[in-house]
């Protein structure tokens, strides 16, 4: 198959890091500086990404792979392949159009990015609040009030052992 393809398209012989030059009878030429081809058989090389401004270079461009960027300190990546950099906030804050703002009461953010999320509602699971929430931390739910009645055990009994040769139903 590979042989047939080569007869049809001479460009299929050009490896990654080169391009198939239409202007020179489809010879394989090395990618020029600041460009790359990550697959074989390409008729041109793609221009290397440049990590400028708030972006910084995580991996240099080579003739066979594009540069990779990340963000300068105080910023974090957003989007596929770190297409954008967004400002960090402190834990307990979220980024708004007007900058970093503290989480409203009843919400928290335990990261330097993302939005403030509501505290867990323990009562929805029939549990009680063991540790109160803060701007930086979610509440910790404890056992339900019923579980705390005298004589109640919080230890779960072990699962019955399976007999050898039996598969679960």
């Amino acid at each position: 198959f590979e042989r047939t393809r080569s007869l049809q398209d001479p460009c299929s012989n050009c490896p990654a890091g080169t391009f198939c030059d239409n202007n020179r009878n489809q010879i394989c030429s090395p990618c020029p500086p600041n460009s790359f081809s990550s697959a074989g058989g390409q008729r041109t090389c793609d221009i290397c990404r440049q990590c400028k401004g708030v972006f910084r270079t995580r991996k240099e461009c080579s003739s066979t792979s594009n540069a990779e960027c990340d963000c300068t300190p105080g910023f974090h990546c957003l989007g596929a392949g770190c297409s954008m950099c967004e400002q960090d906030c402190k834990q307990g804050q979220e980024l708004t159009k007007k900058g970093c703002k503290d989480c409203c009461f009843g919400t928290f953010n335990d990261q330097k990015r993302g939005i403030c999320r509501p505290w867990t509602n323990c009562s929805l699971d029939g549990k009680s609040v063991l540790v109160n929430g803060t701007k930086e931390r979610d509440v910790v739910c404890g056992p339900s009030p019923a579980d705390l009645s005298p004589g109640a055990s919080s230890v779960t009994p072990p699962a019955p052992a399976r007999e050898p040769g039996h598969s679960p139903q």
Epitope: N22, R43, C45
Partner: antibody, heavy 123, light 107 residues
């Protein structure tokens, strides 16, 4: 800025060859292909051929192989196209164009165009 | 040779309209499709190369799309200065070939 300067018009006698010029400025002349394109009155565009000034490597559309000869003068950054034995069929506007950056994604596009030379073949 | 076909030879539109011009290749051209604008005075400019990449200085109201054999140029908000003839050109294989052009006029 990139400029490709062409004379506005040429009047040619039938059978007497004509050499059209295209003076390039604003970029490294030897590093980019120069193309020539023909446009008959009220018609579309036809690619004639191209030349790489650094080593004078040329390509031609088969249709123009015996009609056009492409050359360059590196010292003056000028490309030339000679039309042999002109007839009324050769009356047209001829554009020289610069190709995109060598090997990169715009390589097979013509990113800058001259104003064109209007060639009239008439006795 | 690869044939390039622009089925619409002329197109009439109003200022502010969204206009789409199409171009078809006789075989797959792997996105090596360029669009040019020719003004009534004969001046030619590259608008879009490699299907969708905007040439420097070209207004963002111009955009390109397509793949394989079918490609299109869109002008999102037609302005008076866009009145011109538009040509597609394939750069996939020598000889490079152009479509017949689409002349854009104002209603």
């Amino acid at each position: 800025q990139v400029q490709l300067q062409q004379p506005g018009a040429e009047l040619v006698r039938p059978g007497a060859s004509v050499k059209l010029s295209c003076k390039a400025s604003g970029y490294t002349f030897t590093s980019y292909w120069i193309n020539w394109v023909k446009q008959r009155p009220g018609q579309g565009l036809e690619w004639i051929g191209n030349i790489y000034p650094s080593d004078s490597y040329t390509n031609y559309d088969q249709k123009f192989k015996d009609k056009a000869t492409l050359t360059v003068d590196k010292s003056s950054s000028t490309a030339y196209m000679q039309l042999s034995s002109p007839t009324s069929e050769d009356s047209a506007v001829y554009y020289c164009t610069k190709s995109g950056e060598y090997g990169k994604i715009g390589y097979y596009a013509m990113d800058y165009w001259g104003q064109g030379t209007s060639v009239t073949v008439s006795s | 040779d690869i044939q390039m076909t622009q089925t619409t030879s002329s197109l009439s539109a109003s200022l502010g309209d969204r206009v789409t011009i199409s171009c078809r290749a006789s075989q797959d051209i792997s996105n090596y499709l360029n669009w040019y604008q020719q003004k009534p005075d004969g001046t030619v400019k590259l608008l879009i190369y490699y299907t969708s990449r905007l040439h420097s200085g070209v207004p963002s109201r111009f955009s390109g799309s397509g793949s394989g054999t079918d490609y299109s140029l869109t002008i999102s908000n037609l302005e008076q200065e866009d009145i011109a003839t538009y040509f597609c050109q394939q750069g996939n294989t020598l000889p490079y070939t152009f479509g017949g052009g689409t002349k854009l006029e104002i209603k």
